[in-house]
Amino acid sequence: QEEDLPRPSISAEPGTVIPLGSHVTFVCRGPVGVQTFRLERESRSTYNDTEDVSQASPSESEARFRIDSVSEGNAGPYRCIYYKPPKWSEQSDYLELLVKETSGGPDSPDTEPGSSAGPTQRPSDNSHNEHAPASQGLKAEHLYHHHHHH
């Protein structure tokens, strides 16, 4: 009778290749009823949480994590996970953020539009049946910035 939580998806706006100093917004999506979305870096101990969750559609909720001014330190893989009490979902696939030196402006044509990583059919390597992220780490507000207060 255990109800499985669908894996979240992650996307980036305006894309995954971002000029230095420009902004990027990661969008995490999951089912309705999500309380907390977590955006993780490659290490699960570096993350940012938000409860600024909106309904994207009748069956889907989303949260947005914005980086106002991208630096080289922001490059790398990101993924989403969510908390629908009392459980945590599995993680989304990774989405790789690339930061490029500015040759053109923020609207440079080689900025990839709306890349995303959605759920796949392969099982995740950590089952989360205890539905808790393994990390004991602290949130890294210095890495991500979004409009929800901590």
Epitope: Q1, E3, Q35, T36, E51, P85, S135, K139, H148, H150
Partner: antibody, heavy 111, light 109 residues
């Protein structure tokens, strides 16, 4: 073994303040809602509020202003109560949303 | 004001029988956030059911939850003496607000 335990309950005079502590073992509270609930002697359960993984506090309308919930470490959450009256006499429980509960700690408000 | 109204106490049934406890909310709960708890004297509550109908780990299948919106039910079948307790519903609402029902005492004859 994952568990919770409340501490700090005692006799307090009306108008006084008290801080209760919920200590977690075996898990990181930054990954869960940590709820506070109270139960007056012989009465039902009453939700007070909780602190979320993001560190946000949510509480019952009646508790706002007098009751404050905050994290003090990755294993402890505190409930600060002020302007206490006899009607606040109860056993106070903390819970990990809602699958694991502490045994409770008794708070008595009396002169 | 958010109110959860439960079946009045006590509810009595014989060993092997079935008990149904209802819980009515003054507003729709958010996304099936409805739990049922069992509490015995001197003990903390124990969660039986969450998300309206999902059994908590280790809870016997004699317990079942159902409902939606504002009307919810906990059914206990094949009653055992150990089921004598007070049962509470808990609704979760938009804005991360929770409200307990008043409790229903179950007696086993």
């Amino acid at each position: 073994e994952q568990s919770l335990k409340e501490s700090g309950g005692r006799l307090v005079t009306p108008g006084g303040s008290l801080t209760l502590t919920c200590t977690a073992s075996g898990f990181d509270i930054n990954n869960y809602n940590i709820q506070w609930v109270r139960q007056a002697p012989g009465k039902g359960l009453e939700w007070i509020g909780f602190i979320s993984p993001a560190g946000n506090e949510y509480s019952a309308t009646w508790a706002k202003g007098r009751f404050t919930i905050y994290k003090t470490s990755s294993t402890t959450v505190e409930l600060k109560m002020t302007s206490l009256t006899a009607s606040d006499t109860a056993t106070y429980f903390c819970a990990r949303h809602w699958d694991s509960w502490g045994p409770g700690t008794l708070v008595t408000i009396s002169s | 004001e958010l109110v959860m109204t439960q079946t009045e106490s006590p509810v009595s049934a014989a060993v092997g029988g079935t008990v149904t406890i209802s819980c009515q909310s003054s507003q729709s709960v958010y996304s099936n956030r409805l739990s049922w708890f069992q509490q015995k004297p001197g003990q903390p509550p124990k969660e039986l059911v969450y998300w309206t109908s999902t059994l908590q780990s280790g809870v016997p299948s004699r317990f079942s939850g159902s409902g939606s919106g504002t009307q919810f039910t906990l059914t206990i079948s094949d009653l055992e003496c150990d089921d004598a307790a007070t049962y509470y519903c808990l609704g979760g609402y938009s804005g991360n607000i929770y409200v307990f029902g008043g409790g229903t005492e179950v007696e086993i004859k």
